[in-house]
């Protein structure tokens, strides 16, 4: 999906009002400097691409974050403020339902969400170019 035509300010507002709190709650108990920041993004569409990938794509050691509160709110924000986004996700959602696993917070998931916090922080930068 090409995130170029999203309403970035509305997504930013959704992040500041709720998603950020849910990320904080997920990370509760984690040490501030436990994880290095290794994922970056250069503009807002790129940030959303990376956010979508880390939030919804299973990775080794972290089967799924998609049912977490921050992920569901991220999905809702993208569906509302990115034209055509929800249509592209129907097939992906069907596939995810088939392989959903028991929800377990692993260290790898915490590291992944730490990277997500960094990506969201970059997305919110007022001077970050749109494209």
């Amino acid at each position: 999906y090409d995130f170029t035509n999203c309403d970035f300010e509305k997504i930013k507002a959704a992040y500041l009002s709720t998603i950020s709190k849910d990320l904080i709650t997920y990370m509760s108990g984690t040490k501030s400097t436990e994880f290095n920041n290794t994922v970056s993004c250069s503009n807002r569409p790129h940030c959303l691409t990376e956010i979508q990938s880390l939030t919804f794509n299973p990775t080794a050691g972290c089967a799924s974050l998609a049912k977490e509160m921050f992920a569901m709110k991220t999905k809702a924000a993208l569906a509302i403020w990115c034209p055509g986004y929800s249509e592209t996700q129907i097939n992906a959602t069907q596939a995810m339902k088939k392989r959903r696993k028991r929800k377990v917070t692993t260290n790898k998931c915490l590291e992944q969400v730490s990277q997500l916090q960094g990506l969201w922080r970059r997305f919110n930068r007022p001077l970050l170019k749109q494209q």
Epitope: S20, K21, I24, T25, M27, S28, G29, T30, K31, S32, T33, E34, F35, N36, N37, S40, S114, Q115, Q117, G118, R121, R122, R125
Partner: antibody
Framework: QVQLLQPGTELVKPGASVKLSCKAS????????MHWVKQRPGQGLEWIGE????????DYNQNFRGKATLTVDMSSSTAYMQLSSLTSEDSAVYYC???????????WGQGTTLTVSS | DIVMTQSHKFMSTSVGDRVNITCKAS??????VAWYQQKPGQSPKLLIY???MRHTGVPDRFTGSGSGTDFTLTISNVQSEDLADYFC?????????FGSGTKLEIK
């Protein structure tokens, strides 16, 4: 181990500028955010702003925009804070402090005592 | 900005006593609260993060509790070396803010 080294004192005249330093060691400089915190004598702590050494992006407390400018020198793993148009209100201890993506401060410098006096 | 209020500027206690230092946030900060100890002439030191997690090397007589808007740092069996200023800080929302501090005095 992580260390943040700051000079002990700076004495500057009113109206002048000063550049405070914070030399980091014991970790990868670009991995974490560097913050600056102000403490006036006998008072509380006030967050000034943060800089991401990986790309020099800064965020400031609104109260310090135009007063403080944060920079880094990658070659020496040193963070700087320049304070401009100094007045007696700027006399304080200034700390650098370190965080990851979660913004509480596990590591602090020893602080630089800035005195603004003619 | 979120205001962190420490209603007691000073608290007096005796060695061996138990003392509660409180901090109130002006809005919900979940459990994103840290506590710092600052001894005279020193930089602040992290005691507690995530409202109740003890930082490495902090004696277990220091305990944090609370969530939402009300937070407490409890020092049980107070020692003379606990004479210090104690600050709370919220990191739930930008701008990160501190309480004004509570000075613990030993009788």
């Amino acid at each position: 181990q992580v260390q943040l080294l700051q000079p002990g004192t700076e004495l500057v005249k009113p109206g002048a500028s000063v550049k405070l330093s914070c030399k980091a060691s014991g970790y990868t400089f670009t991995s974490y955010l560097m913050h600056w915190v102000k403490q006036r004598p006998g008072q509380g702590l006030e967050w000034i702003g943060e800089i991401d050494p990986s790309d020099s992006y800064t965020d400031y407390n609104q109260n310090f925009r135009g007063k403080a400018t944060l920079t880094v020198d990658m070659s020496s793993s040193t963070a700087y804070m320049q304070l401009s148009s100094l007045t007696s209100e700027d006399s304080a201890v200034y700390y650098c402090a370190l965080t990851g993506t979660i913004n509480y401060f596990d590591y602090w410098g020893q602080g630089t005592t800035l005195t603004v006096s003619s | 900005d979120i205001v962190m209020t420490q209603s007691h500027k000073f608290m007096s206690t005796s060695v061996g006593d138990r003392v509660n230092i409180t901090c109130k946030a002006s809005q919900d900060v979940v459990t994103a609260v840290a506590w710092y100890q600052q001894k005279p002439g020193q930089s602040p030191k992290l005691l507690i993060y995530w409202a109740s997690m003890r930082h490495t090397g902090v004696p277990d007589r220091f305990t944090g509790s609370g969530s939402g808007t009300d937070f407490t740092l409890t020092i049980s069996n107070v020692q003379s070396e606990d004479l210090a200023d104690y600050f709370c800080q919220q990191y739930s929302s930008f701008t990160f803010t501190f309480g004004s501090g509570t000075k613990l005095e030993i009788k």
